[in-house]
Amino acid sequence: KAMHVAQPAVVLASSRGIASFVCEYASPGKATEVRVTVLRQADSQVTEVCAATYMMGNELTFLDDSICTGTSSGNQVNLTIQGLRAMDTGLYICKVELMYPPPYYLGIGNGTQIYVIDPEPCPDSD
């Protein structure tokens, strides 16, 4: 079953290569277990950036080596991606699945264009 997912159109990463955005889903029921996946689309290639599952009201659990962190509040997921560089600029798509209880719902956002600008190196100080 399909579900609507909303996310901001554009986000600019900080000078430290950190970008945050909210992924909001219109839950048709009372889901207790949710899976969130962030995918990057660039040059028609799609790659998985990170994925997490969480029980409603709890922290998102990403893999240990993940570049993502996040928190949830109701039907909103606050996602933060770290370690970004200019080459990581692209469309970051939020995918939400309501895993339990049945029925299973899937929603895919339109994507957030994240712009990353590498900081200029500091000039040498004499």
């Epitope: 399909a2 995918l39 790659t47 998985e48």
Partner: nanobody
Framework: EVQLVESGGGLVQAGGSLRLSCAAS????????MGWFRQAPGKEQEFVAD????????YYADSVKGRFTISRDNAKNTVYLQMNSLKPEDTALYYC????????????WGQGTQVTVQS
């Protein structure tokens, strides 16, 4: 045209095992993910398990965790569901599904294979 064909369903006693297979045909492709869903008569569709190609990462519904194992053979474009310690409540029509890319949703579905567990 991609086709998914499930097999391996049947009638089994509670506590028994079955191994479901889902073979993809119709071309050479690399799926982002393949999974299993089930639907019992008069009930909503339920997610069972899936596996994502990128890291071979698996995910299971709590109701089957520790009893079911999903695996895939990329060379054969086939995904398997090993079901152990079956319970009467596992009785359902089991569907295989495949995702071409992570942002396409479940693009392809099989016709399903019936699993019946008798107590």
């Amino acid at each position: 045209e991609v086709q998914l064909v499930e097999s391996g369903g049947g009638l089994v006693q509670a506590g028994g095992s079955l191994r479901l297979s889902c073979a993809a045909s119709g071309g050479t492709f690399s799926f982002y993910g393949m999974g299993w869903f089930r639907q019992a008569p008069g009930k909503e569709q339920e997610f069972v398990a899936d596996i994502r190609t990128s890291a071979g990462r698996t995910y299971y519904a709590d109701s089957v965790k520790g009893r079911f194992t999903i695996s895939r053979d990329n060379a054969k474009n086939t995904v398997y569901l090993q079901m152990n310690s079956l319970k009467p409540e596992d009785t359902a029509l089991y569907y295989c599904a495949a995702e071409m890319s992570g942002i396409s949703g479940w693009d392809y579905w099989g016709q399903g294979t019936q699993v019946t567990v008798q107590s």
